[in-house]
């Protein structure tokens, strides 16, 4: 029998340029009579144009919703009711071609054409895009708070905040032709639930979403987003009611930046430069295409690309890359944002060099990508270290910590976390190396102690990049480096003259002069440690709650012993900057470290002094007894302590701790404590120092109180942020 044809609604969005009209400010106000009359005329013209083509039979409805510069640009949407089997045949490209063809056919015609009665439409200025019913609904919900802004070349336009009576607003932004718009979003409140979405077109088309941000992101307090061209839309959706705008938006047109480079690398190892997407650290724009050609000086070298919080992965089934597509020597890889460092190593097989292409495959983009490039020796990619094939990084081998996710850096070790004697491969503990007493059969542990040696897992790297064999040579009163750099920055780690309480757990004034108390509204929240004249280190998880993220809330006390009283040695500071480790992950506690910049430098005294920071190669030997200090609870679930408490804890081998915590212990963690429980850190100690005393008598920061199962529970250790695992970031920030 007869079967009715199934019809489907196909939605299109677009814009057209009118050459014989000019844009005026009146047209930005939807309530103005100018807007109403222009809309009526433009709507009539649009309907007539569509119905003049073979699309006319499918015409359902249309709307002109906005105007812009150029001389006059009309922004519209329309719906066609199409037989289902024709759906794919009427793509936006086909519809655009049909409408352009119609416009061209009447350009020189003297016959009266209804849609040309008032408007001279530029065929070249017609754009048709795919849209959906959902997109139109989203657009309509913003029309009560719709702002159009044109921003000229060289201008930076600060956008007027949203109308708080509305639940949603749209900023329609336009810049000069041939330029691209750069939008800057700065969150100004610590906490909010507002949502902002940026689009690469005039309206909220889901398929042209560049990015969306939500809720006063602390990870990205400032976001810069690039459109692919001169048009952009920003949609705001209200979160919690607030009288203050939780963000500031500004926009500026910028010129297209070429992203093509030819480089010839020097005959040396390590990083030689940086490649980045245009306007880094801005988000890369939709339709970004970068092509970098690097020439390597010899086939002995491979090319290394070091990424920060971004990795390259093979993508199955030719699915589009959502975070950037890379082609390297005809291999297709997809970018992936991760909270880890990563390196891609490219073996070089021909002198022709290597071409690296980066493309944004979809309109959805993300933070700009920056990559350091350099050479590595193909026959020995990681001198003195282990090449972790999982992430391309060079990691210490046989140091007792599985730095590589597959643990291969700790496999097949003759001597793990010890020194291997040359004579017979016996293992001796590291503190015995270069201590003036031969422990190996023929004394190989005391050889080469006064000269440079190849860098390795436990060697110390001097400032001139040479390495010394003696483990932990920092600040021991004897220069071991030729340049003396192992004895620089040594005004640290000394306790003040203190009257110790023998056998007690209460600390005395000046005993732990680096100890900090981090307080909010007079209440102790976390511990910390002074590491430089203006820097205190603590745990990132202290700022986990949005309400704790603002620097203005915090006061840092140094030289403090008692919480309920002040004494003359005590000083307090406000916080001018708060930096969480960029790889910090709340769920796993990985990279649990933060740095607070004090509002003024400390004046050192017997009660206020920094602790020494270890070098990356510093070895805190498992078994060593170290100390934790803090005002944390004296029992699980109890109130914080009034007096600064101290307790000695033993450092635990990583594998043993990892077993206890079911392999949740990462290489940036360190374990200490007792199986019997009893001695441990507790709530309120977080961020406080775990310090170990070197033979020189100086105290080095080994860890920060991070997490653990309960407090002092039997069979569970305390887990600390391993300072040697995050030291490069600390040094980068502090210096």
């Amino acid at each position: 029998g007869y079967k009715a044809e199934v019809m489907v609604s196909q939605v299109y969005s677009g814009s057209l340029r009118v050459l014989n009209r000019h844009f005026s400010q009146d047209l930005t106000r939807r309530e103005s009579s100018a807007f109403r009359s222009e809309t009526a005329k433009a709507q009539k013209m649009l309907k007539e144009l569509i119905t003049s083509t073979r699309l006319g039979t499918y015409y359902n409805s249309s709307s002109v919703y906005s105007f812009g510069e150029g001389p006059l640009t009309c922004f519209f949407w329309f719906i066609l009711q199409i037989p289902e089997h024709r759906r794919l045949m009427l793509s936006p490209e086909v519809v655009q071609a049909l409408l352009v063809e119609e416009l061209l056919s009447t350009v020189n015609s003297s016959a009266a054409v209804p849609y040309r009665a008032e408007y001279e439409v530029d065929p070249e200025g017609l754009v048709i895009l795919e849209a959906s019913v959902k997109d139109i609904a989203a657009l309509n919900s913003t029309l009560g708070c719709y702002r159009y802004s044109y921003v000229g070349q060289g201008q930076v336009l600060r956008l007027k905040g949203p109308d708080h009576l509305a639940s949603s607003c749209l900023w329609h932004l336009q810049g000069p032709k041939d330029l691209m718009l750069k939008l800057r979003l700065e969150w100004t409140l610590a906490e909010c639930r507002d949502r902002l979405a940026m689009y690469d077109v005039a309206g909220p088309l889901e398929k042209r979403l560049i990015t969306s941000v939500y809720g006063c992101s602390r990870q990205e307090p400032v976001v810069e987003v690039l459109a692919s061209g001169a048009i952009m839309a920003v949609v705001w959706k209200k979160g919690l009611h607030s009288y203050y705008d939780p963000f500031v938006l500004s926009v500026q047109p910028v010129v297209f930046q070429a992203c093509e480079v030819n480089l010839t690398l020097d005959n040396r190892l390590d990083s030689q430069g940086v490649l980045s997407t245009p306007y880094f650290p801005s988000y890369y724009s939709p339709q970004t295409h970068c092509s970098w050609h690097l020439t390597v000086p010899s086939l002995d070298y491979g090319l290394a690309l070091w990424f920060d919080a971004y990795a390259l992965r093979r993508q199955k089934y030719d699915l589009p890359c959502t975070q950037g597509q890379w082609t390297i020597q005809n291999r297709r890889l997809c970018g992936l944002r991760i909270l880890q460092p990563y390196a891609e190593r490219i073996p070089v097989v021909a002198t022709a060099g290597i071409t690296i292409n980066f493309t944004s495959q979809i309109s959805l983009t993300g933070p700009g990508v920056r990559v350091h490039y350099g050479l590595y020796n193909q026959s020995d990619p990681c001198p003195g270290e282990f090449l972790c094939s999982v992430n391309g990084l060079c990691v210490p081998a046989c140091d007792g910590v599985k730095d590589c996710p597959n643990g291969l850096d700790e496999r097949n070790c003759v001597c793990r976390a010890t020194f291997q004697c040359k004579e017979d491969s016996t293992c001796i503990s590291l503190p015995k190396v270069c201590d003036g007493q031969p422990d190996c059969l023929n004394g190989s542990d005391e050889e080469q102690c006064q000269e440079g040696v190849p860098c390795g897992t436990f060697t110390f790297q001097c400032e001139d990049r040479s390495c010394v064999k003696k483990p932990n040579p920092q600040c021991d009163g004897r220069p071991d480096c030729r340049d003396g750099s192992d004895e620089e920055h040594c005004d640290c780690g000394l306790q003040g003259p203190s009257s110790r309480i023998v056998g007690g757990a209460v600390s005395s004034e000046g005993e732990w002069p680096w100890q900090a108390s981090l307080q909010v509204r007079g209440r102790h929240i976390c511990g910390g440690a002074l590491i430089a004249d203006r820097w205190v280190i603590t745990a990132a998880h202290c700022f986990q709650e949005d309400s704790m993220a603002s620097t203005v809330l915090w006061t840092v006390f140094l030289g403090k012993v008692w919480q309920n009283s002040r004494w003359p040695g005590e000083v307090s500071f406000k916080v001018s900057r708060l930096l969480l480790h960029p790889y910090h992950e709340e769920d796993s506690h990985d990279y649990d470290v933060a740095l607070l910049q004090l509002d003024h430098p400390v004046v050192r005294s017997a009660a206020v002094r920094p602790v020494c920071l270890p070098a990356r190669s510093h070895f805190f030997e498992p078994g060593l007894h170290c100390w934790i200090t803090g005002w944390g609870a004296l029992r699980e679930g109890g109130p914080i302590s009034n007096a600064l408490q101290k307790v000695d804890v033993q450092l635990i081998p990583q594998d043993l701790c990892s077993e206890v915590y079911r392999y949740q212990v990462t290489p940036r963690m360190l374990c200490a404590g007792y199986r019997k429980g009893k001695k441990d850190a507790c709530q309120g100690d977080s961020g406080g120092p775990l310090v170990c005393k070197a033979l020189s008598g100086r105290w080095f920061l080994a860890g920060l109180v991070s997490w653990g199962l309960g407090c002092g529970r039997p069979n569970y250790f305390g887990v600390y942020t391993r300072i040697t695992g995050v030291i490069s970031w600390i040094q980068q920030v502090v210096t």
């Epitope: 503990s429 503190p431 056998g503 030997e621 498992p622 078994g623 060593l624 007894h625 033993q650 635990i652 081998p653 043993l656 200490a672 404590g673 007792y674 199986r675 019997k676 039997p714 069979n715 250790f717």
Partner: antibody, heavy 120, light 107 residues
């Protein structure tokens, strides 16, 4: 390569004293708690005493309390057991043993043992 | 002091047999218990710690279980080198105390 070597054993008359020593090598002695355990001929094991890594804490079996003293010299990597007022029932092989990490406190490594005979 | 009672005091078994030794504490000791193996004229060797944890290098045929007051050492399939005396040791409280030992002999 952990090695524990006991010395100082022998035959002694009841009421007299004897000092046992244990020389440790192959590990950082000052990090670990140390123990003495004994075994009378043909009998089971009996825990005698232990000392913490820094010498600040000692514990004894009731049978030796007040007569035996455990001590250590971390600079010489040596553990000692001073045995006074010896009795016939103190006759045994004496083992020195090293704890694993204090967080675990198991007797991981043992010396080969030294015989002490208390007899008139 | 906490008393540790081991049973049986001796047992005869053949190669390939499954052997179970039990240890009972006179009070709750959580899981603070280790198992040691001693061969004639030799020092004891740690097999199991914290009741169920196998010391590294010890064959997986040895296993420990239990907590509170009742503990078990199981040898899944007895091998010729397993004929020895086995002791449990509580380290929950001072003074530490051993069980009286279980001698495993060839049938």
């Amino acid at each position: 390569q952990v090695q524990l070597v006991e010395s100082g054993g022998g035959v002694v008359q009841p009421g007299r004293s004897l000092r046992l020593s244990c020389a440790a090598s192959g590990f950082t002695f000052s990090y670990f708690g140390m123990h003495w355990v004994r075994q009378a001929p043909g009998k089971g094991l009996e825990w005698v005493a232990d000392i913490s890594y820094d010498g600040s804490d000692e514990n004894y079996a009731d049978s030796v309390k007040g007569r035996f003293t455990i001590s250590r010299d971390n600079s010489k990597n040596t553990l000692s057991l001073q045995m006074n007022s010896l009795r016939a029932e103190d006759t045994a092989v004496y083992y020195c043993a090293k704890e694993t990490y204090q967080s675990l406190m198991y007797l991981e490594y043992w010396g080969q043992g030294i015989l002490v005979t208390v007899s008139s | 002091a906490i008393q540790m009672t081991q049973s049986p005091s001796s047992l005869s078994a053949s190669v390939g047999d499954r052997v179970t030794i039990t240890c009972r504490a006179s009070q709750d000791i959580r899981n603070d218990l280790g198992w040691y193996q001693q061969k004639p004229g030799k020092a004891p060797k740690l097999l199991i710690y914290t009741a169920p944890s196998l010391q590294s290098g010890v064959p997986s045929r040895f296993s420990g279980s239990g907590s509170g007051t009742d503990f078990t050492l199981t040898i899944g399939s007895l091998q010729p080198e397993d004929f020895a005396t086995y002791y449990c040791l509580q380290d929950y409280n001072y003074p530490w105390t051993f069980g009286q030992g279980t001698k495993v002999e060839i049938k």
